[in-house]
């Protein structure tokens, strides 16, 4: 018996078999910056982490998820001053005593070198040069992301 997640995964794979992919020509919305296969929106106002999370949701996006050190560096290159901090989608899970991304996955300890404490009410921010643990109630800027998905053309099987 497959779990619902496994079943969903199989359904997605089957639907992929019926499509061919071509490079997406999808552009980022106005005011969003493209970084590889993502669109990023750097806020100009400040908010606590929870409000930042909610703001991204209202924009049909999520707080930034960073896959690896390379993506971190490329994102940091877009930050124009060392005294600007941005929330990303990573906070401390007290129950699991670990850093947890908002998509449910845990931080790979090699990905980000976090300066500061891993404790309750701690959320992660990035600056031009570093990654910081800050209190989630701190009002700083934040980064929303949208994934750029490739455009798919339906291929109908021969009858």
């Amino acid at each position: 018996q497959k779990s619902s997640i496994e079943k969903c995964s199989v359904d997605i794979q089957q639907s992929r078999n019926k499509t061919t992919e071509r490079p997406g020509l999808l552009n980022c919305p106005i005011y969003w910056q493209q970084l590889r296969e993502k669109c990023l929106l750097f806020s100009h106002t400040v908010n606590p982490w929870n409000n930042s999370l909610a703001d991204c949701s209202t924009k049909e996006s999520s707080l930034l998820l960073i896959r690896d050190k390379d993506e971190l560096i490329h994102t940091q290159n877009l930050i124009r001053d060392k005294a600007i901090l941005f929330w990303i989608g990573l906070n401390f899970s007290l129950s699991e005593k670990n850093w947890k991304w908002i998509n449910g996955s845990f931080l790979n300890s090699n990905d980000l070198e976090i300066r500061g404490d891993a404790k309750e009410n701690s959320c992660i921010s990035i600056s031009q040069t570093s990654v910081y643990s800050e209190y989630c109630s701190t009002e700083i800027r934040w980064i929303c992301q949208k994934e750029l998905t490739p455009v798919r053309n339906k291929v109908y099987p021969d009858s």
Epitope: D81, A83, L85, R115, D117, S133, Y135, S137, T138, E139
Partner: antibody
Framework: EVQLVESGGGLVQPGGSLRLSCAAS????????MSWVRQAPGKGLEWVSA????????YYADSVKGRFTISRDNSKNTLYLQMNSLRAEDTAVYYC????????????WGQGTLVTVSS | DIQMTQSPSSLSASVGDRVTITCRAS??????LNWYQQKPGKAPKLLIY???SLQSGVPSRFSGSGSGTDFALTISSLQPEDFATYYC?????????FGQGTKVEIK
């Protein structure tokens, strides 16, 4: 009510050291960046240094870099400025202020403490 | 560093006058401009943040305008308690910098 109270100022000889403190109350101290701003006698305002809420990140004006160190103790709701290798041009009233991340404005200020560097 | 230049350096005005102080940045700072009031022997007080937002508790006769490089602080009807020195400040980039101040004196 938000309150910031500086202390530790005084007369010091050139080359000497001084440590300023700023006791904060009336707000969640650890959730705010904090700054030091100074004002030489009869002159304008000059930003000196800032520190993030957790204390993890610090920023300095070029005029004090390498000589001054900003720090904080969130368990004591206190901000510090360690000033070494003091010069005559460091003579000023030193204010602590709430704010320091861009684009924060300094929305609350202490009353200031006077530092005089003279032989 | 971003230089902030205020004008005039000082001005004389009477109670009830409309007063405007200008501040120019050496490069574009968007709307990251704040205004402070300082009275002799006292700490500065935030009046306006983000170029035009009135700080809580500040009388509505104070207003701010501008974006990019040119900004203004206007006092619509000068009151006795408004005689002070006013500073602009940019929070666009570090180091944070202030204008040299404008002293508003009684005519």
């Amino acid at each position: 009510e938000v309150q910031l109270v500086e202390s530790g100022g005084g007369l010091v000889q050139p080359g000497g050291s001084l440590r300023l403190s700023c006791a904060a109350s009336g707000f969640t101290f650890s959730s705010y960046a904090m700054s030091w701003v100074r004002q030489a006698p009869g002159k304008g305002l000059e930003w000196v240094s800032a520190i993030s809420g957790s204390g993890g990140s610090t920023y300095y004006a070029d005029s004090v870099k390498g000589r001054f160190t900003i720090s904080r103790d969130n368990s004591k709701n206190t901000l510090y400025l360690q000033m070494n290798s003091l010069r005559a041009e460091d003579t000023a009233v030193y204010y602590c202020a709430r704010g320091g991340y861009l684009p924060d404005a300094f929305d609350y200020w202490g009353q200031g403490t006077l530092v005089t560097v003279s032989s | 560093d971003i230089q902030m230049t205020q004008s005039p350096s000082s001005l004389s005005a009477s109670v009830g006058d409309r007063v405007t102080i200008t501040c120019r940045a050496s490069q574009s700072i968007s709307s990251y401009l704040n205004w402070y009031q300082q009275k002799p022997g006292k700490a500065p007080k935030l009046l306006i943040y983000a170029a035009s937002s009135l700080q809580s508790g500040v009388p509505s006769r104070f207003s701010g305008s501008g974006s990019g490089t040119d900004f203004a602080l206007t006092i619509s009807s000068l009151q006795p308690e408004d005689f002070a020195t006013y500073y602009c400040q940019q929070t666009y980039s570090t180091p944070l910098t202030f204008g040299q101040g404008t002293k508003v004196e009684i005519k």
